[in-house]
Structures are given as structure tokens and as C-alpha cells.
């Protein structure tokens, strides 16, 4: 285990927390419960108690946010960074923030609470078996009333437990119609609508009339969201799967991986994919809010990342249903706060919120159906998480940013550095690297930890290159360079030792330029570098666009691969080939799809 510098900790044992806002991915009661259970893990092994309060005077403020959310450490969209937390202290210190661009679940797919049926409000179980078929979303199969339902256990055929999924045919929210269900079709501004609509609103909320004529009655409600069938990616992000849909002449009542080589589940967002070509990916397993929160609260209590892979405080997301705390976590937290006074409590139990009473007219009986085909099984989990580096330390304390789930190089948006070493391409990101060898069907191998192979290096690298003759590896990060020859390292040395002035903040890339010579890049400038002397020729300074016309001026990485130069900006590269002393851009592409041959979404 590791603690923050100075063993930062709370100096009182009755810790308070405030849930400042919520994610729409989970019912509020489930979020409340996940956080309470996560705190209970730590109170079970220490003298700490955790009390929920309703003001920002709390020790730990919990917030869901996206991108720049007011603390100077922006989130990065889906996947990547999942959450971050600050070590104990006043104000923002101790607070835990969760990236709301993630799909938050309990680690096993979207959480869809049910109503009525016979399962007492239990959540859907995805995937579930019904009449021998596997379903990864709510379905209307077996019903003539169009109400979506799901099984609340893995197998409806054997267990017979079911409930109804959120549906505008069951109820609406807010509005002015007391939660009555939608009336389809309904008239709005003289037009007939047979589904929820966003027409007439600028905020994107779906609504419907609860009588046949909105223009006359002005009664409406908002349509419940259907987390189980709201698609991501594809060309219809945010829209709902339409079941059944037709694909290649065949009808599908659930998400399918047909037509894809990568096994990912998808659905059409109209009833006919063949004619409309509208589709998106079905929700994945999501990230367990309970497990991520337990990790974050560890930081908020004073624990930094652990180097023990099985520990909760290890900086990688890994879904587990076993007890999350490892001995290392317990040792760490007890180092700060001591053990819990005897007796040890029983592990916390979870409660499922009770469903509200059914309306007077409620949907009838369980479904009966005779399906004609069996789709593929439910979705598999996302790639497990890889570590991300901490942001630079603040004036008084360091903060930690844990848990990024990009173990698959194909999920990395932007690599820190790329280099050809030996005859393989090495891709570096946040303390990890992957190796890639070109070839039909080959995939990047990894991730491997940089610290295991090159222990002297920082987690964040700006550029890397190998000098072929001496086999020396140059690693640049900020104003420093490390030179590895085999396992021995020279450095870190400051860039000015290479003859680069104080105005050069980083080296963003390198290309070979004749025997024992390289070109070093920094932003818009480049220099000729003598590898043996380990010095740049200051007179060789030049502008990148003079030597390489057509490449972007704000590249973050330049590397050589298969004798061609690659200039990276964002997720893209500009490839330059040299013919008779002329440098010409001959290709622009995606690093992941076009170099690493990743499957396209």
C-alpha cells in the first residue's frame, strides 16, 4: 500500500459525505446504496463512521461530472478515466468525482428497475433466457399489449420471475398528467404521433400526450428513459433500439452480433436496417459504481495506489463479485486510522428499494411465446482498466486520478508516444505500452507496464526513439531525457544538456536523418541531433512546415515506421514519404484503425 506524502488523513473519525448530484444511468436509490456499501467496506475495518449529510460542508462531496467539471482535472469522455478523488483535507480535498460519460452499472450491464410483475421491483437480469433464447434488453416478445418486460433472474424459463421495464405505455414522469401513460396516437400541432417525440422542445426531452389530442387537452408527460436499449456509437447514438428489426432479411428481437467480426452487440434503431441503415451498439456491462466508488473513497481517506494487483487500490478496474478489500488495502487504511474496535461487524448487506404500489389497472400475467430463432448470448465485459498517471501536484498536496479501462490499445484515443523499436511498433500511454507487429489479423500485444521494463521512466512520455546502430533508446518527458542501453540507464538529463534552449518545453518526436543523425521535433520546430555526441546543432533549427509541408503544425508525436515519417495530431496521423529529397504527405489515417488494424466501430 501507499499513502500520500505526509500521510494525509482525516483527523476525526465521524466522516460525512454529500451526494451532490446523480447519474441518470442508475436509479437514485441504487446509487445511494452503492455509495453506502462502498463506505461500509472501509468502516468495517477501521474506527471510521460515515454519515450522509445534505450540504457542501461534508468532508467528502460526491459529484458526477463530464469533461471540465470545475476542478481543473477534466474527464475524457467514455472509457479512459473513470473517476478521480482528492486526498483528505478541506474544500475540494476529500472529494470524489465520477465521469458521467461512463455507463455506470453494478458491473453486470445496465440496471433496469422493474415495476409490477412478480419480482418485487427487482432489477432486470441481462442477459436472460426466455423460451430458449437469450435477451440482452427488455422485450415485448410473448405479449400482445406491447409492454416491454424482462426476467429478473438469468433464466425466465426455469425461475418464472419477471417485471415490466420503464415504458411510456406504463407511465410517464413529471409533466402535468399525474404519471398517466402515453396515449398513442396523439395529435400535436395538428399532426399525429405514434411514439414519444422531442418536437416542440429545445432541450431534447422525449414527451407524449396522455390523451388523444394534446392541442385540445394540453395534458402531457415525459417518457421514461430505457437504459437497456439506448444505443451508443454507430450512427444513431442516444436513440433506442427498435425490436424487432430486420437485418439481411431476418428478424431480430434482441441485440445481435451478427454481421460483426468482433462479437459486439448491436441493434437497429428503426424497424428495418436493410433499408434505413440506422444502428448503434447496445449498452455494455458498464462499470461497477460500487467498486469504483470503493476505490475512490480509499483515496479520499488517504490511500494512494497500491502495487498489489489484487488490491482494491490497484489502479486498474477489474470487476469482481468477491470481497473487494485485499489484506494490502486493510493494512493501508489501518496504518492511517488503526483497527476497528472489536467486535468485527458482519459484512454489509444490500437492500433493494421496494416498488411502489401498482395502479388499479396493471399489466397482466407473464409472457407466453414460441420464438423462431435463438440469438447470440449477452454482451461480454469491456476491456479491463489500465492505470493513468496522477496530474501534476498542486501547491500543497498531490492528487490522484485512478482507474482507466483502456487495456485494449484499440480503445486508446491518443497515445503519449509511438516508436519503432527493433522491428516492432511500441505504443506508450499512461505508464503502459503495447507492442505491434504488422501482419494479417495481428493485434497489439499488451498492455505491459513501462516500469517493469524501464523502471527509471516517468509514466507520461512525450516521445521515444531507437538509434539503430547503438540500439540506444531515448525517452523524452517534459524537459528531461533518459537514455537506455539494454538495462542500464543514463539520466534523467535536462534537455539543455543536449543543446536545446530553455524555451524548448518538450521533445515531441524524432526521425532518422542519415547515419548517426536524427531530427528532433518540438512543436513547430526541429533540430538535427548527433546521437554519438548527444548534442543538437543549434544552427540547424528549422520550421517543421518548411521541411514537411502539409503536416499539421500542432503535432503531439512524430515517429518513424517502415521508413516513413508519421506526424500525429489527435487520433490521426499524416504519413510522409521522401522521394528525391521531396517530403510529401501520402496518407492521412487513424492510428488505431489504419496502423494497428483495429476493427472499425
Amino acid at each position: 500500500f501507499q499513502t500520500f506524502e505526509g500521510d494525509l488523513k482525516w483527523h476525526h473519525h465521524n466522516i460525512t459525505y454529500w451526494i451532490q448530484n446523480y447519474s441518470e444511468d442508475l436509479p437514485r436509490a441504487v446509487i445511494d446504496d452503492a455509495f453506502a456499501r462502498a463506505f461500509a467496506l472501509w468502516s468495517a475495518v477501521t474506527p471510521l463512521t460515515f454519515t450522509r449529510v445534505y450540504s457542501r460542508d461534508a468532508d467528502i462531496v460526491i459529484q458526477f461530472g463530464v469533461a471540465e467539471h470545475g476542478d481543473g482535472y477534466p474527464f475524457d469522455g467514455k472509457d479512459g478515466l473513470l473517476a478521480h478523488a482528492f486526498p483528505p483535507g478541506p474544500g475540494i480535498q476529500g472529494d470524489a468525482h465520477f465521469d458521467d460519460d461512463e455507463l455506470w452499472s453494478l458491473g453486470k450491464g445496465v440496471v433496469v428497475p422493474t415495476r409490477f410483475g412478480n419480482a418485487d421491483g427487482a432489477a432486470c437480469h441481462f442477459p436472460f433466457i426466455f423460451e430458449g433464447r437469450s435477451y440482452s434488453a427488455c422485450t415485448t416478445d410473448g405479449r400482445s399489449d406491447g409492454l416491454p418486460w424482462c426476467s429478473t433472474t438469468a433464466n425466465y424459463d426455469t425461475d418464472d420471475r419477471f417485471g415490466f421495464c420503464p415504458s411510456e405505455r406504463l407511465y410517464t414522469q413529471d409533466g402535468n398528467a399525474d404519471g398517466k401513460p402515453c396515449q398513442f396516437p396523439f395529435i400535436f400541432q395538428g399532426q399525429s404521433y405514434s411514439a414519444c417525440t422531442t418536437d416542440g422542445r429545445s432541450d431534447g426531452y422525449r414527451w407524449c400526450a396522455t390523451t388523444a389530442n394534446y392541442d385540445r387537452d394540453k395534458l402531457f408527460g415525459f417518457c421514461p428513459t430505457r437504459a437497456d436499449s439506448t444505443v451508443m456509437g454507430g450512427n444513431s447514438a442516444g436513440e433506442l433500439c427498435v425490436f424487432p428489426f430486420t437485418f439481411l432479411g431476418k428478424e431480430y428481437s434482441t441485440c445481435t452480433s451478427e454481421g460483426r467480426g468482433d462479437g459486439r452487440l448491436w441493434c437497429a434503431t428503426t424497424s428495418n436496417f436493410d433499408s434505413d441503415k440506422k444502428w448503434g451498439f447496445c449498452p455494455d456491462q458498464g462499470y461497477s459504481l460500487f467498486l469504483v466508488a470503493a476505490h475512490e473513497f480509499g483515496h479520499a481517506l488517504g490511500l494512494d495506489h497500491s502495487s498489489v494487483p489484487e488490491a482494491l487500490m490497484y489502479p486498474m478496474y477489474r470487476f469482481t463479485e468477491g470481497p473487494p478489500l485485499h489484506k494490502d488495502d486493510v493494512n493501508g487504511i489501518r496504518h492511517l486510522y488503526g483497527p476497528r474496535p472489536e467486535p468485527e461487524p458482519r459484512p454489509p448487506t444490500t437492500t433493494t428499494p421496494q416498488p411502489t404500489a401498482p395502479p388499479t389497472v396493471c399489466p397482466t400475467g407473464p409472457p407466453t411465446v414460441h420464438p423462431s430463432e435463438r440469438p447470440t448470448a449477452g454482451p461480454t465485459g469491456p476491456p479491463s482498466a489500465g492505470p493513468t498517471g496522477p496530474p501534476t501536484a498542486g501547491p500543497s498536496t498531490a492528487t490522484t486520478v485512478p482507474l482507466s479501462p483502456v487495456d485494449d490499445a484499440c480503445n486508446v484515443n491518443i497515445f503519449d508516444a509511438i516508436a519503432e523499436i527493433g522491428n516492432q511498433l511500441y505504443l506508450f500511454k499512461d505508464g503502459k505500452y503495447w507492442r505491434f507487429s504488422e501482419g494479417r489479423g495481428s493485434r497489439p500485444q499488451g498492455p505491459f507496464l513501462i516500469a517493469d521494463k524501464w523502471p527509471a521512466l516517468p509514466r507520461k512520455l512525450d516521445s521515444v526513439f531507437e538509434e539503430r546502430l547503438s540500439k540506444k533508446l531515448f525517452f523524452f518527458s517534459g524537459r528531461q531525457v533518459w537514455v537506455y542501453t539494454g538495462a542500464s540507464v543514463l539520466g534523467p538529463r535536462r534537455l539543455d544538456k543536449l543543446g536545446l534552449g530553455a524555451d524548448v518545453a518538450q521533445v515531441t518526436g524524432a526521425l532518422r536523418s542519415g547515419r548517426g543523425k536524427m531530427l528532433l521535433f518540438s512543436g513547430r520546430r526541429l533540430w538535427r541531433f548527433d546521437v554519438k555526441a548527444q548534442m543538437v546543432d543549434p544552427r540547424s533549427a528549422s520550421e517543421v512546415d518548411r521541411m514537411f509541408p502539409g503536416v499539421p503544425l500542432d503535432t503531439h508525436d512524430v515517429f518513424q515506421y517502415r521508413e516513413k515519417a508519421y506526424f500525429c495530431q489527435d487520433r490521426f496521423y499524416w504519413r510522409v514519404s521522401s522521394r528525391s529529397e521531396l517530403n510529401q504527405v501520402d496518407q492521412v489515417g487513424y492510428v488505431t484503425y489504419d496502423i494497428l488494424q483495429c476493427p472499425e466501430d
Epitope: 471540465e68 478541506p90 475540494i92 429545445s202 432541450d203 426531452y205 498542486g394
Partner: antibody, heavy 116, light 108 residues
Framework: EVQLVQSGAEVKKPGASVKVSCKAS????????ISWVRQAPGQGLEWMGW????????NYAQKLQGRVTMTTDTSTSTAYMELRSLRSDDTAVYYC?????????WGQGTTVTVSS | QAVLTQPPSASGTPGQRVTISCSGS????????VNWYQQLPGTAPKLLIY???HRPSGVPDRFSGSNSWNTASLAISGLQSEDEADYYC?????????FGGGTKVTVL
């Protein structure tokens, strides 16, 4: 007592720069952000930007990008806002505010007049 | 840049209830949290409500806030003469802070 005390009024010519200071006391300066908000005469509040005293990261209003710089000096618990290339429509009262789930503590305001 | 829309003015007699609305034009105010500020004439603004409905200590309980779907509201029940002031709503929108145009509350 938690308070923010701002520097005094300034009169500047168009094209000049102004630097307003905001000294914090009564709380741990580095555990909170500071927002800067201005109010032109008879007008509403306009957010200019924000700086984290924890890590010095900044976030500026798009409209002022390139003209405004916010900094902090943690040794004196002071935040600074510099606005360059002043124009007559920059005439306003400039406020600093501690920002933590709402701007809960405000400075008294600094009047900046831009006039030729 | 998103805009938060407030009515320019509202009024009531002492003891009455006054409600000020704040709606988002290009983003869902309902999925953001909203803060409200009171600015008495000639003074700096004061935080009145944070995170939709929470009152900082010292703010009388006649001030209350709510936020659902695309409208946030500030209610003043039992209006008093000292409540005569400008009221501003504020929210975050894609990395920027946005203020409403302000509502002048007059006690008749």
C-alpha cells in the same frame, strides 16, 4: 472570518492592461477555486473565468480567451486577474469569488473604468 | 454559449409568495445543478441557493429552490421588504459558467 479583499479602483486608457488582486483569508486557500465575475454598469453578472488554487489550472470564458490571465500566489493566498487590450466596454465592477459548489464568498469588488 | 433565461422583473406585496424561473435555451438545465444569487443594491452578490435546493447557513428558510426537466425555480415565501434585490441563476454548461440575465424583485 472567511473573506476576500480586492485591490482598489483603477482608471485605464483603452489598449492598456489592468491587474486586479484578491487576497483570501480565514480558510485554506489551496483547497478552493476562485472565479472572477464582472458587472458592467446597470447590467447583469458575467463570468470571466476560474482558477484552481489547488493546481493553478484555469478555465476562461471563450469571449475573453487571449485577453485574460488568472494566476495565484499560494504563499500570500492571493489570486490575480489581468485583462489586456482594454476597451470602453470593459468598464465594470470586477469581483473575485471563492468557488466550491457555488460562489459562496465574494470580494467587495474593484471598479475598473476604461476611458480615453 | 448557452443562455439562461429569467423574467426581467417580479413583484409582490409583503407576505406574498414570489417565484422566479430560470430556463436553459440550448442545454438541459434539469440535468445541471443550479445556484441562485441575491444582489442587494450597491453590494456584491450573495449565494442564496446552491445545488438546486440547498441553503447556505444564514439564509432564511423562506428562500427555496427546485430544478426539474428544463426549468429551475427560486421561490420566496413570505416576501419582506429587505428581499428587494436582483436575483441571478447560474449553472455550468460544457466547461463554462453561465449566469441568467437577472430578475429584479420589487416589494410593493
Amino acid at each position: 472570518e472567511v473573506q476576500l479583499v480586492q485591490s482598489g479602483a483603477e482608471v485605464k486608457k483603452p489598449g492598456a492592461s489592468v491587474k486586479v488582486s484578491c487576497k483570501a483569508s480565514g480558510y485554506t486557500f489551496t483547497s478552493y477555486g476562485i472565479s472572477w465575475v464582472r458587472q458592467a454598469p446597470g447590467q447583469g453578472l458575467e463570468w470571466m473565468g476560474w482558477i484552481s488554487a489547488y493546481n493553478a489550472n484555469t478555465n476562461y470564458a471563450q469571449k475573453l480567451q487571449g485577453r485574460v490571465t488568472m494566476t495565484t500566489d499560494t504563499s500570500t493566498s492571493t489570486a490575480y486577474m489581468e485583462l489586456r487590450s482594454l476597451r470602453s466596454d470593459d468598464t465594470a465592477v470586477y469581483y473575485c469569488a471563492r468557488d466550491y459548489y457555488g460562489m459562496d464568498v465574494w470580494g467587495q469588488g474593484t471598479t475598473v473604468t476604461v476611458s480615453s | 454559449q448557452a443562455v439562461l433565461t429569467q423574467p426581467p422583473s417580479a413583484s409582490g406585496t409583503p407576505g406574498q409568495r414570489v417565484t422566479i424561473s430560470c430556463s436553459g435555451s440550448t442545454f438541459n438545465i434539469g440535468s445541471n445543478t443550479v445556484n441562485w444569487y441575491q444582489q442587494l443594491p450597491g453590494t456584491a452578490p450573495k449565494l442564496l441557493i446552491y445545488s438546486d435546493s440547498h441553503r447556505p447557513s444564514g439564509v432564511p428558510d423562506r428562500f427555496s429552490g427546485s430544478n426539474s426537466w428544463n426549468t429551475a425555480s427560486l421561490a420566496i415565501s413570505g416576501l419582506q421588504s429587505e428581499d428587494e434585490a436582483d436575483y441571478y441563476c447560474q449553472a455550468w454548461d460544457s466547461s463554462a459558467v453561465v449566469f441568467g440575465g437577472g430578475t429584479k424583485v420589487t416589494v410593493l
